[in-house]
């Protein structure tokens, strides 16, 4: 049957997520050759990032543990050109990359991207150094975009007896302190695979001790209120779950949130069918449950964050992770995360190498960017519950929140339903009483053009989404439905529905 009845639970919020629930990352590999960090000076990129504020910007990834801060390192020519062009002007308002520098970097980027992906696949990582200027570029990007920077420190700098050597971190802290930078911190990336990446085995207890040491450093500096997040472990398979448990026992007290990473697929082998498969989407549920089991058994009540996540690891799946098809995984992950109590979800990556970026190498927003922007504008922090009546629920996936009260079009008490249709026919959703006769605004996303689900362009309610200019995002125009309408959701599409004047007490 193509008409589907929904049930809502709106008595009280199941969870409260962060206003920065949907957050983003910049992979630390962008600093492998620090010249490419200058791309973050693009006004267009900042406009796009600003659209997702409030959010965290996590600078991290495998390269985290192969980057060394060198305060004496000279700026590159490109960095110098960039900073010189900003002299005597408001960098957030007028800052831009000198056109010749931008052109040069963009021409060289495809080669750099190949190099980074090759390094990743060969698992041969070399140390690189970054300068004060690199830190400045990164912080300026975050600050000008209204994002809160989380910086990943190198955890593979070790003494002979495998204690963490904090001296390089101290240099960076001192520099950031001197500049008055407000930064949160992480230590290490996917420590469960250090052995594979660097022939060094660090157990969870040792890592916990290292975090305690970093926490002490932070308390001694001007960063005494700085937040510390970790341990950024990978998926909770047996050894990783064990590592997380021993880490939390040893060092869990000093972290502000527990971070872990999740990918559905291997980017090299993923198929379009995988991206549309509810079995694949449901794998995430058991991963979340495992993490919560570990956290609740060691540090009950500690907040859990997805510190890095996307559709497929290894830079994403070519011709899939940057298309409309990727939105099914992304929206479902956001919905499940909120429903299961994850406070923040950090999308790998905002901009950078691979295919899972929100913004491409030309600084053009991809379908998942527009999906993220809509999510930001419409979805509030109070998480409620929607479900499909009957047994066939897995291909029609529905989530419910209070509406984002920062949206001037809506008011407290309104509801935002978001829904994913993986069926090959249109489904018609019927709202439960007393919402069935409310005015509903529809925000339907469909792919544009002949590539269908593999399109890199998207339409909102039939209108193509594109930037007005480098400084301006387009209006996100709702399509109001007649009160009492069923909510039509076409085959292989996803949509937000704002139920206006819902007057839900839990949302007020």
């Amino acid at each position: 049957q193509d008409v589907v009845d929904l049930d809502f639970f709106t008595q009280e919020p199941l969870h409260l997520v962060s206003p920065s629930f949907l957050s983003v990352t910049i992979d630390a590999n962008l600093a492998t050759d620090p010249r490419f960090l200058i791309l973050l000076g693009s006004p267009k990129l900042r406009t796009l990032a600003r659209g997702l504020s409030p959010a965290y910007l996590r600078f991290g990834g495998t390269k985290t543990d192969f980057l060394i801060f060198d305060p004496k390192k000279e700026s590159t020519f490109e960095e110098r050109s960039y900073w010189q062009s900003q002299v005597n002007q408001d960098i957030c308002k007028y800052g831009s990359i000198p056109p010749d520098v931008e052109e040069k970097l963009r021409l060289e980027w495809p080669y750099q991207e190949q190099l980074l992906l090759r390094e990743h696949y060969q698992k041969k990582f070399k140390n690189s150094t970054y300068s004060r200027s690199s830190v400045d570029v990164l912080y300026t990007f975050a600050n000008c975009s209204g994002l809160d920077l989380i910086f990943g420190l190198n955890a593979l700098l070790r003494t002979a007896d495998l204690q963490w050597n904090s001296s390089n971190a101290q240099l960076l802290l001192d520099y950031c302190s001197s500049k008055g930078y407000n930064i949160s911190w992480e230590l290490g990336n996917e420590p469960n695979s250090f052995l594979k990446k660097a022939d060094i085995f660090i157990n969870g207890s040792q890592l916990g001790e290292d975090f305690i040491q970093l926490h002490k450093l932070l308390r001694k500096s001007t960063f005494k209120n700085a937040k510390l997040y970790g341990p950024d472990v990978g998926q909770p398979r047996r050894k990783t779950a064990k590592m997380l448990k021993s880490f939390l026992k040893a060092g869990g007290e000093v972290i502000d949130s527990v971070t872990w990473h999740h990918y559905y697929l291997n980017g090299r082998t993923a198929t379009k069918e995988d991206f549309l498969n509810p079995d694949v989407l449901d794998i995430f549920i058991s991963s979340v449950q495992k993490v919560f089991q570990v956290v609740e058994s060691t540090r009950p009540g500690k907040k859990v964050w997805l510190g890095e996540t996307s559709s497929a690891y290894g830079g994403g799946a070519p011709l899939l992770s940057d298309t409309f098809a990727a939105g099914f995984m992304w929206l479902d992950k956001l919905g499940l995360s909120a429903r299961m109590g994850i406070e923040v979800v950090m999308r790998q990556v905002f901009f950078g190498a691979g295919n899972y970026h929100l913004v491409d190498e030309n600084f053009d927003p991809l379908p998942d960017y527009w999906l993220s922007l809509l999510f930001k504008k419409l979805v509030g922090t109070k998480v409620l519950m929607a479900s499909v009546q009957g047994s066939k629920r897995r291909k029609l996936r529905v989530y419910l929140h209070c509406t984002n009260t920062d949206n001037p079009r809506y008011k407290e008490g309104d509801l935002t339903l978001y829904a994913i249709n993986l069926h090959n026919v249109t489904k018609y959703l019927r709202l439960p009483y007393p919402f069935s006769n409310k005015q509903v605004d529809k925000y339907l996303l469909r792919p544009l053009g002949p590539h269908g689900l593999l399109s890199k362009s998207v339409q909102l309610n039939g209108l193509t989404l594109k930037m007005v200019d480098d400084q301006t995002l387009p209006p996100l125009m709702e399509k109001p439905l007649r009160p009492g309408s069923s909510l039509g959701l076409p085959a292989f599409s996803y949509s937000f529905f704002v139920i206006r004047n819902a007057k839900v007490a839990a949302c007020i």
Epitope: D2, Y428, P480, R482, G484, S485, S486
Partner: antibody, heavy 122, light 111 residues
Framework: QVQLVESGGGVVQPGRSLRLSCAAS????????MHWVRQAPGKGLEWVAV????????YYADSVKGRFTISRDNSKNTLYLQMNSLRAEDTAVYYC???????????????WGQGTMVTVSS | QSVLTQPPSVSGAPGQRVTISCTGS?????????VHWYQQLPGTAPKLLIY???NRPSGVPDRFSGSKSGTSASLAITGLQAEDEADYYC???????????FGGGTKLTVL
């Protein structure tokens, strides 16, 4: 094929009543919202009333509110318009029309009947 | 007086392009409710020509197109043909009236 056939029109005196019917075939009637639209001689189209696919909602134009009643019998695949207290200005061709998407999710009218003429005259 | 305002008539020579406007208010077209267009040939029932602002039902030639901006919508017909001579109506939903509303209709004459 998909078809709507109106009946019940005729000449009636002001203040009297008339009931129009619209027989549907060729589609799942119970899945579609249905409307009545009228057209006075030489004039434009005027929307009259709508009934949801399951009969749960009914709405009327101000000009007929309180006098006309829209109803449906899904078991008989038939739409009705009960017209009471008829006036001269109700003289028109009355069309029934189907919504363009099921379950009252669209207000475009993709299928129209041929119309039935109602003349209110003393 | 119709809620949606259309010009009473427009005309064009065969092969030309004509547009028919439909102006509403903030409670119908301006609220971004869907606009639909109908063609009514003499002595026949109306036929859906454009639905949802700019979508053509199957069988409608691509010479017909719809657009919308602000409180107005337009129907454009390119490559005008003799058989296009008919009355054209726009329709939308009006939230203040809780019902559908039509324009007064536009008679298209092919010269």
């Amino acid at each position: 094929q998909v078809q709507l056939v109106e009946s019940g029109g005729g000449v009636v005196q002001p203040g009297r009543s008339l009931r129009l019917s619209c027989a549907a075939s060729g589609f799942t009637f119970s899945s579609y919202g249905m409307h009545w639209v009228r057209q006075a001689p030489g004039k434009g189209l005027e929307w009259v009333a709508v009934i949801w696919y399951d009969g749960s909602n009914k709405y009327y134009a101000d000009s007929v509110k309180g006098r006309f009643t829209i109803s449906r019998d899904n078991s008989k695949n038939t739409l009705y318009l009960q017209m009471n207290s008829l006036r001269a200005e109700d003289t028109a061709v009355y069309y029934c029309a189907r919504e363009g998407a099921p379950y009252s999710s669209s207000d475009a009218f993709d299928i129209w009947g041929q119309g039935t003429m109602v003349t209110v005259s003393s | 007086q119709s809620v949606l305002t259309q010009p009473p008539s427009v005309s064009g020579a065969p092969g030309q392009r004509v547009t028919i406007s439909c102006t509403g208010s903030s409670s119908n077209i301006g609220a971004n409710y869907d606009v639909h267009w109908y063609q009514q040939l003499p002595g026949t029932a109306p036929k859906l020509l454009i639905y949802g602002d700019n979508n053509r039902p199957s069988g409608v030639p691509d010479r017909f197109s719809g657009s919308k901006s602000g409180t107005s919508a337009s129907l454009a017909i390119t490559g005008l043909q003799a058989e296009d001579e008919a009355d054209y109506y726009c329709q939308s939903y009006d939230s203040s009236l809780s019902g559908s509303v039509f324009g007064g209709g536009t008679k298209l004459t092919v010269l």
